[in-house]
């Protein structure tokens, strides 16, 4: 393979130096090995992100409405699979839980603050507002676009993608997936959502030049606001309770 | 059934121009990519280009880069390739082809075509 | 652009099973018949493992890493001619072809 990149993530660095010279792509950041045929995890995504700051390259800087979460940006702490570790830090010792998303779901505390587990986002709801059209989108036609982008851009499975609501000109995108649905292969509903934001705020992680072409019975689908609200399969530990958005 | 028809064909003089057209029926234009191939003769087949769905995004192939332009009509689903600059090395059959996955995040891939044009002959001679 | 890499040529007996592979490319394999020069190719594969809903069951598609394989179970003598595969991450490309001959 002369063309030694990786598709599916512009936040690698690659070579042909693996065995038998075949191209192996690392995460910035992280420098852990990631899957060119599918989407990198949010985690180590979030990681490169910062990698990326600090070193001061241009391209995937954030732009300043960037919201991920209520708490903003972090260098996230990721296992051996790239997923979120339980417990994130920042430099000054102050620690948090997080959930499967990488958001946080406990009041912050110090270094003896306990999470026991990652507690799993099972339920993921988009909020798109669109900007205004001649007329609203007929919703079945609105409901097939954004299910073949899915299905076929984030490649995630058309099972976790419960429902398309619309109402003009608020969309909602609603992804569910339980631990026990998601298979070995399947793409989770978290580094979909995530790989979506990006596309969405025109940053897109994809290599090459095509970005996101989403259109329904030929009019553009042009978003002006994205909300994101993350739902754990356990309620989250605030001393006020509240839903966490991102 | 789905159905493209390739015309505009035929001789050309080199330093010309030609420009080919792909007729679509049996199907929503509107929702699918659309390429190119071509195939000199007795040779295999080459990727001249690709046009996304709204027409808002096109690729070349580099021996095509700068001198070819692909352009769609969605209201009477036709695409056009208007090719320049003519050379010996642009003679050979021109296909339409139709592309599956628009969303694909390698779409531009020749592996998502699913329909194909019967082509039409183009000769670039003086 | 990518270089694809498939065998110039394969034979077999009627009603053995051919495996045509491909490799050089991380995207999504097609495979293209085309049955004598100037006639227009007719997908039998795309995205790796779909079948036009007029081609026959006997032909399939796998993919593996980098390469992409076509397999003809129970080949017929109307499945001779030369067969294309097509990928390529960020523009098209296609294989030089395989002959298939069908003894």
């Known amino acids: 393979q002369s063309n030694c990149t990786c598709p599916t993530n512009k936040m690698t660095v690659c070579d042909t130096n693996g065995p038998g010279g075949v191209c192996q792509c690392r995460a910035m950041g992280s420098q852990v090995l990631v899957d060119c045929s599918t989407l990198t995890s949010k985690c180590l995504l979030l990681k490169a992100r910062m990698s990326a700051r600090k070193s001061g390259r241009s391209l995937v800087m954030p732009s300043e409405h960037a919201i991920l979460d209520n708490d903003g940006l972090y260098d996230p702490e990721c296992d051996d699979k790239g997923r979120f570790k339980a417990r994130q830090c920042n430099q000054t010792s102050v620690c948090w839980c997080v959930n499967s998303v990488g958001v946080r779901r406990t009041d912050k505390g110090d270094q003896s603050l306990r999470c026991d587990e990652v507690v799993r986002t099972h339920h993921i709801l988009i909020e798109l507002r669109h900007r205004p059209t001649d007329r609203a989108f007929n919703h079945s036609d609105l409901d097939s676009e954004l299910r073949r982008l899915f299905q076929e851009r984030y490649k995630l499975h058309p099972s976790f993608l419960s429902a398309v609501h619309y109402e003009e000109p608020t969309i909602q995108i609603e992804l569910r997936q339980n631990a026990s649905q998601k298979g070995l292969r399947d793409v989770d509903i978290a580094d979909a959502a995530y790989y979506f934001e990006r596309d969405i705020k025109g940053e897109s992680l994809f290599m090459g030049r095509r970005g996101l072409d989403v259109q329904v019975r030929g009019e553009p689908l042009h978003v002006e606001r994205t909300l994101i609200y993350y739902l754990d399969e356990k309620p989250p530990q605030f001393s006020m309770k509240r839903l966490t958005a991102g | 059934a789905v159905t493209l028809d390739e015309s505009g064909g035929g001789l050309q003089t080199p330093g010309g121009a030609l420009s080919l057209v792909c007729k679509a029926s049996g199907f929503d234009f509107i929702d699918y990519d659309m390429f190119w191939v071509r195939q000199a003769p007795g040779k295999g087949l080459e990727w001249v280009g690709v046009i996304n769905r709204s027409g808002s995004y096109t690729n070349y192939a580099p021996a095509v880069k700068g001198r070819a332009t692909i352009s769609r009509d969605n209201g009477q689903s036709t695409m056009r390739l208007q090719l320049n600059n003519l050379r010996a090395e642009d003679t050979g059959t021109y296909y339409c082809a139709r592309g599956a996955c628009t969303h694909c995040w390698d779409a531009d891939s020749a592996g998502y075509i699913d329909a194909w044009g019967h082509g039409t002959e183009v000769i670039v001679s003086s | 652009a990518l270089a694809l890499t498939q065998p110039s040529s394969v034979s077999a007996n009627p009603g053995e099973t051919v495996k045509i592979t491909c490799s050089g490319s991380s995207g999504s394999y097609g495979w293209f018949q085309q049955k004598s020069p100037g006639s227009a190719p007719v997908t039998v594969i795309y995205w790796n493992d779909k079948r036009p809903s007029d081609i026959p069951s006997r032909f399939s598609g796998s993919t593996s890493g980098s390469t992409g394989t076509l397999t003809i179970t129970g080949v017929q003598a109307d499945d001779e001619a030369v067969y294309f595969c097509?990928?390529?991450?960020?523009?098209?490309?296609f294989g030089a072809g395989t002959t298939l001959t069908v003894l």
């Open positions: 097509g990928n390529a991450d960020s523009s098209g490309t």
